[in-house]
Amino acid sequence: HTAAQDNCTCPTNKMTVCSPDGPGGRCQCRALGSGMAVDCSTLTSKCLLLKARMSAPKNARTLVRPSEHALVDNDGLYDPDCDPEGRFKARQCNQTSVCWCVNSVGVRRTDKGDLSLRCDELVRTHHILIDLRHRPTAGAFNHSDLDAELRRLFRERYRLHPKFVAAVHYEQPTIQIELRQNTSQKAAGDVDIGDAAYYFERDIKGESLFQGRGGLDLRVRGEPLQVERTLIYYLDEIPPKFSMKRLTA
């Protein structure tokens, strides 16, 4: 796997341990927590990042679930099980044998159950809505300039192909970024929208996952764009399965 050869670090994931023990003395980096080898030329999967984060735990965060089929990460941090490719396993269980099914971004999509719970497949999150509120500014940002800046950011910083940024909406002070990526659209080597959204979320919170790169400095025509609130909604290819009790809560 590629990494910065001169000082053997992983530019795209600071939560790694790197050493020149790859083929031909090449730099090889392994994710903390899982020990899995990571490709430092692209984003690391959210599952491996969460696992690494749990090996050095911080305060869990809680978000609000907004609507019927859109999921929000209400459960905060957990230590996930990842498959050999670094994706979330469809079924996740905690140390007390409580299990639940997750989608491809690791967000719970069923009620919690016991070890008998079956999760037949990993359901893909094909639509992510990132809802931001920016701090007050002298005037509204120019919509086209803001739209282009956010599209550029996802291309350049997260290596997300421009075709996966479906839309950028703006009604001051609310910005919405829509990411869409169906299973059929995602080619080998394409960054997953879930991974890009997670890196963006961490950047916005001032917790950049990149090694040796400055934090996110978002500017629109030189004017700083400072985000004061972020909500991320996840829509799956198959709607989630929660009991009526939860839906009416």
């Epitope: 739209d147 550029r152 910083r157 290596r159 075709k163 790169r213």
Partner: antibody, heavy 117, light 106 residues
Framework: EVQLVQSGPEVKKPGASVKVSCKAS????????IGWVRQAPGQGLEWIGE????????YYTEKFKGRVTMTADTSTSTAYMELSSLRSEDTAVYYC??????????WGQGTLVTVSS | DIQLTQSPSSLSASVGDRVTITCSAS?????MYWYQQKPGKAPKLLIY???TLASGVPSRFSGSGSGTDFTLTISSLQPEDFATYYC?????????FGQGTKLEIK
């Protein structure tokens, strides 16, 4: 095979406008970005701006804002760059280039625009 | 705007020589891109992400650096390498290029 084929050379008078075309083939047009770069004779490369072909989102550099218009016709997979109020210093080769997760991965052959009275 | 300054502006070298071109950014950038341009032709992507060779680019080309200082190296010059080389950033709008380094035959 990815190809960007640009329109032919143009000679314009100061104050006039020029519209350069860039016809794309070999890829899904609306999935990408087309950027425009110019190069004055014997000089370096200067970025003008870019258009996101799927959404129509455009970013122009401050220097060209108000004078440049970028458009795209998805039915013919053609991008256009129009520059108005031409002056002699706009004499240059204008390139279109495709953008993806790279700023420019494939380039057109260039269009020479000469501004002369 | 991020300014990119290439050094040297021009360079005379012989076939087989090792050549190094540097690019200095006025503020930190994520990655650097390098292009090769021959007279009358469009630029061609040579190196992306500071150090990764674009498809079909010979291994005698290499790139390194991070932050504000980047380098393009040609380990053993070949006749077809005599051209002008540009660095370019897109870490922020507007995208900017270095002024170019013209590599000539000695």
């Amino acid at each position: 095979e990815v190809q960007l084929v640009q329109s032919g050379p143009e000679v314009k008078k100061p104050g006039a406008s020029v519209k350069v075309s860039c016809k794309a083939s070999g890829f899904t047009f609306t999935d990408y970005v087309i950027g425009w770069v110019r190069q004055a004779p014997g000089q370096g490369l200067e970025w003008i701006g870019e258009i996101y072909l799927g959404s129509g989102t455009i970013y122009y550099t401050e220097k060209f804002k108000g004078r440049v218009t970028m458009t795209a016709d998805t039915s013919t997979s053609t991008a256009y760059m129009e520059l108005s109020s031409l002056r002699s210093e706009d004499t240059a080769v204008y390139y279109c280039a495709r953008g993806s997760i790279f700023p420019f991965d494939y380039w057109g052959q260039g269009t020479l625009v000469t501004v002369s009275s | 705007d991020i300014q990119l300054t290439q050094s040297p502006s021009s360079l005379s070298a012989s076939v087989g020589d090792r050549v190094t071109i540097t690019c200095s950014a006025s503020s930190s950038v994520s990655y650097m891109y390098w292009y090769q341009q021959k007279p009358g032709k469009a630029p061609k992507l040579l190196i992306y992400d500071a150090s990764t060779l674009a498809s079909g680019v010979p291994s005698r080309f290499s790139g390194s650096g991070s932050g504000t200082d980047f380098t393009l190296t040609i380990s053993s010059l070949q006749p077809e390498d005599f051209a002008t080389y540009y660095c370019q950033q897109w870490s922020s709008y507007p995208y900017t290029f270095g002024q170019g380094t013209k590599l000539e035959i000695k």
